[in-house]
Amino acid sequence: NWVNVISDLKKIEDLIQSMHIDATLYTESDVHPSCKVTAMKCFLLELQVISLESGDASIHDTVENLIILANNSLSSNGNVTESGCKECEELEEKNIKEFLQSFVHIVQMFINTS
């Protein structure tokens, strides 16, 4: 599932590049392992912002699929309460390219621990 998430992120990156969307998104670029689920939540919430702002059906479908995949992959620990983690709004705002790169990095963290 996580491998499919990465391929979806690559697809979103390609779609966004062709549309020239200029947005800044809350980005966790240095995820602590004890905050990875919280960070994943922030990434997914921001992805929905991309979907809504783009108004593009392909991006919408891909983001929706990515959320479905992430939910299923996290079904065992998605409701774990992590303490001492940053709120999404406390994160640094970065451009879409940097956001997606950081997203891939956190997904790889999940792959490495699964």
Epitope: A57, S58, E64, N65, I67, I68, N71, N72, S75
Partner: antibody, heavy 122, light 112 residues
Amino acid sequence: EVRLMASGGGLVQPGGSLRLSCAASEFTFSNYAMSWVRQAPGKGLEWVATISRGGDYTYYPDSVKGRFTISRDNSKNTLYLQMNSLRAEDTAVYYCARRVSMITGGWAMDYWGQGTLVTVSS
Amino acid sequence: DVVMTQSPLSLPVTLGQPASISCRSSQSIVDITGNTYLEWYQQRPGQSPRLLIYKVFNRFSGVPDRFSGSGSGTDFTLKISRVEAEDVGVYYCFQDTFVPYTFGQGTKLEIK
């Protein structure tokens, strides 16, 4: 008023195939994910398949995975369910349903068709 | 798979009286973004199912306000404040947080 008309049901032998159709009208079909849900005679509801708005993503339970294929033709406002290797336990009324977006709405099936009966028997 | 368990399976109610249906999931159905994709559907005799409630407590358009949904995590409830004759049918809870999406067994509401 949103309209969904399922068709294509009938009697088929075990191991056989059938293709169901669902004609959609009175809404922009390509803006919605769609699902199939079935109901065996006298039984409860069972989710069968879901397809994304553009048709790139499909989801199934293990009970039909590899045997059923959901697809859509947005130019014809039509949803399909190709059913292969049919079994007696696939006998049911099959409903098509429109799905609200997870991102903009509630990810619910807000409108349902009237259903078409599939009977698998020798 | 997430198992949805409803109770009671049969619910005889006097007209004008309240009714309550419980639905319990085998695990939390809160998704990663904090949403809970729990719906309630009504199926009147001989008819197709109809959406009543989505995301636990949101009433779908055209649904009378005597229907209400509540709950969180793994425990959910559908309440009808005053049962009317047209409410007869089977009520299903449904989770679509995790694939495969799953329905409860259904609760048959009938008039005493």
